[in-house]
């Protein structure tokens, strides 16, 4: 098929890097400065992304790929090939329309970026708030109120001892 | 029409300096992305230097940094490559091009010159 192509279509010659150039009888014409073709038998070249602003460099575009950006320090990436980047906030905090604010009561957020989560609700599963939460951490649930009833421990109890003559399972 | 016409090469020892110079008609040299392109014998094209984002920012392939020098003069719509040190591999045929932006996104480069021949041998 390669062959069939090659025969059909001179431009599939033509390598990354590259533009087949209809101008000039078909022929491989290097990109011009600041643009690049990732793949072989383009008729154009591709404009290299421009890191600029809040956005800064991560790997320099060459003749064969595009530039790619990462966020200035304060600020993170969003959308596939980091297409936004948005204000960092502290722990216990969330980004709003009007800048980062404080997790509400009962909320928490243990990253620098993403909403307040609510804490988790331990009586669904049946148990018992052993840590309270915070604006930055979630609460940590504990055994269940039955486990800690009188006479029960909530020490897991060590294994059995071995009887004497028997080899390990 | 647009035009671009080469002059200023020639034979140069090397270590010798040249200045090559593209005159421009039919388009304001000033508002495109314009540059040098060069043909080695027996090889491909190759991006010299450009002046590009409307004098924003230059360009320099590696083989040619520190030794090249691009400008340009708006009032005579003339493009300018000074070159120093030069190199028995900088010898080729010089073209003064123009970067192209297409409707659709993609970029290709227009040269319509003859060239200039510069040839470096002692």
């Known amino acids: 098929f390669e062959r069939t192509r090659s025969l059909q279509d001179p431009c599939s010659n033509c390598p990354a890097g590259t533009f087949c150039d209809n101008n000039r009888n078909q022929i491989c014409s290097p990109c011009p400065p600041n643009s690049f073709s990732s793949a072989g038998g383009q008729r154009t070249c591709d404009i290299c992304r421009q890191c600029k602003g809040v956005f800064r460099t991560r790997k320099e575009c060459s003749s064969t790929s595009n530039a790619e950006c990462d966020c200035t320090p304060g600020f993170h990436c969003l959308g596939a090939g980091c297409s936004m980047c948005e204000q960092d906030c502290k722990q216990g905090q969330e980004l709003t329309k009007k800048g980062c604010k404080d997790c509400c009561f009962g909320t928490f957020n243990d990253q620098k970026r993403g909403i307040c989560r609510p804490w988790t609700n331990c009586s669904l599963d049946g148990k018992s708030v052993l840590v309270n939460g915070t604006k930055e951490r979630d609460v940590v649930c504990g055994p269940s109120p039955a486990d800690l009833s009188p006479g029960a421990s909530s020490v897991t109890p060590p294994a059995p001892a071995r009887e004497p003559g028997h080899s390990p399972q | 029409e647009v035009q671009l016409l080469e002059s200023g090469g020639g034979l140069v020892q090397p270590g010798g300096s040249l200045r090559l110079s593209c005159a421009a008609s039919?388009?304001?040299?000033?508002?495109?992305?314009v540059g040098w392109v060069r043909q080695a014998p027996g090889k491909g094209l190759e991006w010299v230097s450009a002046?590009?984002?409307?004098?924003?920012?230059?360009y320099y392939a590696e083989s040619v940094k520190g030794r090249f020098t691009i400008s340009r003069d708006n009032a005579k719509n003339t493009l300018y490559l000074q070159m120093s040190s030069l190199r028995a591999e900088d010898t080729a045929v010089y073209y003064c091009?123009?970067?192209?932006?297409?409707?659709?996104?993609?970029?290709?480069?227009?040269?319509r010159g003859q060239g200039t021949q510069v040839t470096v041998s002692s």
């Open positions: 091009a123009r970067v192209v932006y297409h409707a659709g996104g993609g970029v290709t480069f227009d040269y």
């Open positions: 002046i590009l984002d409307f004098g924003g920012s230059t």
């Open positions: 039919g388009f304001t040299l000033s508002a495109e992305d």
